[in-house]
């Protein structure tokens, strides 16, 4: 039961995380105009990965897409790539994990296959989360660098009298959404990997128990042949005790005192 819960929770957490990564990637508020210590503006600037926007005090908002690809900073391109890779990996991970869920039965899929898929999706979620965190962190670093550079030459004199105020940008809401979403996806991935360990049956070779029947000097090994559902493909049949009808979770538990007559 604990395995199912861990797997289900991991899936849900990752789903929320990936939704957050998608939202962050699409958001326009990756960087917002720094209002601290600035003249009061009737125009509020903010920028995303795909376009930059202005909210006028008149209430109107206007956005302009970055129509150039080559003219964009390499760092911005890198952030875009990281976020997209994160989304793609996360989406594939979600797809794989749906089929891996213990509560969903697809044909005669064995536990070993589900365990494999759970681990695969878990790894994908971890990488997806790391991509998102890396992308957001790279952008944040870029902002910090630019912020202090623009602070250093906040007012660049032009012809003595004219001043050109550089618009300084600070962290936007999308960065926090991205960090949290990346973290959730990462946690979800770890949970999936943990669940995978529980899904894989223990390949325990139980020692033969000798029963000395009266009048007969023969050793008896109980239990019929049963195909192994161990992690990975295993063609060898192992003799394991079939203790009658039990729940799926109980099948994977260690032998108890009732397993031996």
């Amino acid at each position: 039961m604990a395995v199912t819960a861990c797997q289900g929770l991991g899936f849900v957490v990752s789903l929320i995380g990936i939704a957050g990564i998608i939202a962050a990637t699409c958001m326009d508020q990756w960087s917002t105009q720094d209002l601290y210590n600035n003249p009061v503006t009737a125009v509020f600037n903010y920028q995303g990965l795909w376009r930059s926007c202005v909210r006028e005090s008149s209430g109107f908002t206007e956005c302009r897409g970055y129509f150039t690809l080559l003219g964009l900073p390499a760092m911005l391109q890198a952030v875009r790539a990281l976020m997209i890779v994160g989304i793609v990996l996360g989406a594939i991970g979600l797809l794989v994990s749906i089929f891996a869920l213990k509560c969903i039965r697809i044909g005669s899929m064995e536990d070993s296959a589900k365990a494999n898929m759970t681990l695969t999706s878990g790894i994908m979620f971890i990488v997806s989360g790391l991509c998102a965190i890396a992308g957001v962190s790279v952008f944040a670093n870029m902002l910090v660098t630019n912020f202090w550079m623009s602070t250093a030459n906040m007012y660049t004199g032009m012809g003595g009298m004219v001043q050109t105020v550089q618009t300084r940008y600070t962290f936007g809401a999308a960065l926090f959404v991205g960090w949290v979403a990346g973290g959730l996806t990462l946690i979800g991935g770890v949970m999936m990997c943990i669940a995978c360990r529980g899904l894989a049956p223990e390949e325990t070779n139980y020692k033969a128990v000798s029963y000395h029947a009266s009048g007969h000097s023969v050793a008896y090994k109980p239990g019929g042949f049963k195909a192994s559902t161990g992690f990975g493909s295993n063609t060898k049949n192992k003799k394991i005790y079939d203790g009658g009808a039990r729940t799926e979770d109980e099948v994977q538990s260690y032998p108890s005192k009732h397993d031996y007559v």
Partner: antibody, heavy 117, light 113 residues
Framework: EVQLVESGGGLVQPGGSLRLSCAGS????????MSWVRQAPGKGLEWVSS???????YYLDSVKGRFTISRDNAKNTLYLQMSSLRAEDTAVYYC???????????WGQGTLVTVSS | DIVMTQSPDSLAVSLGERATINCKSS????????????LTWYQQKPGQPPKKLIY???TRESGVPDRFSGSGSGTDFTLTISSLQAEDLAVYYC?????????FGQGTKLEIK
């Protein structure tokens, strides 16, 4: 047709108070950022105050603390409450709507405020 | 506060001739977000409220004759009337809409030569 009609102007003594009104027809004032602009006799235009979405207000430094911009959505009216009036506040006061580019596109005909003893 | 300086203070031009009014801002009015300049040109005739001609430095208001055009970016802007008509005689103001307090130029009076 959009119309803005100012009222409430008149002669007032220095230190006195006055409330200007701007009634809108063909326009819902609450959905737009609105401004007051004044023009002293024979002089240029001077922005006085603005009210934007969320009721955020902005004022010219020389009127801060003395003037208050507000609006009554039910009456579709913009107000400028003026107190501690000075001789230099004498002007024609216009109300105007802020639109694209923060530009003032619709203006009222103006109301004259004279501060004199 | 942003200082808006218009030149000349008055301008006498013959009918049918080109009229050019300049406006200089003490700070850049160019928004990095949408690459637009927050400058507006108004026309005011005696006894009337101002009328918006040009916004975003170069976008003509609907209904404004195409002989009126705006240009410039950053701190230097120009209003051009390509062929002056009698009804164009008025005072012209530039206004910056980027920073509070919103400020106007002192005005340029356009007269017939």
């Amino acid at each position: 047709e959009v119309q803005l009609v100012e009222s409430g102007g008149g002669l007032v003594q220095p230190g006195g108070s006055l409330r200007l009104s701007c009634a809108g027809s063909g326009i819902t004032l609450s959905t737009y950022a609105m401004s007051w602009v004044r023009q002293a006799p024979g002089k240029g235009l001077e922005w006085v105050s603005s009210i934007i979405s969320g009721g955020i207000t902005y004022y010219l430094d020389s009127v801060k603390g003395r003037f208050t911009i507000s609006r009554d959505n039910a009456k579709n009216t913009l107000y400028l409450q003026m107190s501690s009036l000075r001789a230099e506040d004498t002007a024609v006061y216009y109300c105007a709507r802020k639109y694209h580019g923060n530009a003032l596109d619709y203006w009222g005909q103006g109301t004259l405020v004279t501060v004199s003893s | 506060d942003i200082v808006m300086t218009q030149s000349p203070d008055s301008l006498a031009v013959s009918l049918g001739e080109r009229a050019t009014i300049n406006c200089k801002s003490s700070q850049s009015l160019l928004s990095s977000g949408n690459q637009r300049n927050y400058l507006t040109w108004y026309q005011q005739k005696p006894g009337q409220p101002p009328k918006k001609l040009i916004y975003w430095a170069s976008t003509r208001e609907s209904g404004v004759p195409d002989r009126f055009s705006g240009s410039g970016s950053g701190t230097d802007f120009t209003l051009t009337i390509s062929s002056l008509q009698a009804e164009d005689l008025a005072v012209y103001y530039c206004q910056q809409n980027y920073f509070y307090p919103l400020t106007f130029g002192q005005g340029t009076k356009l007269e017939i030569k």
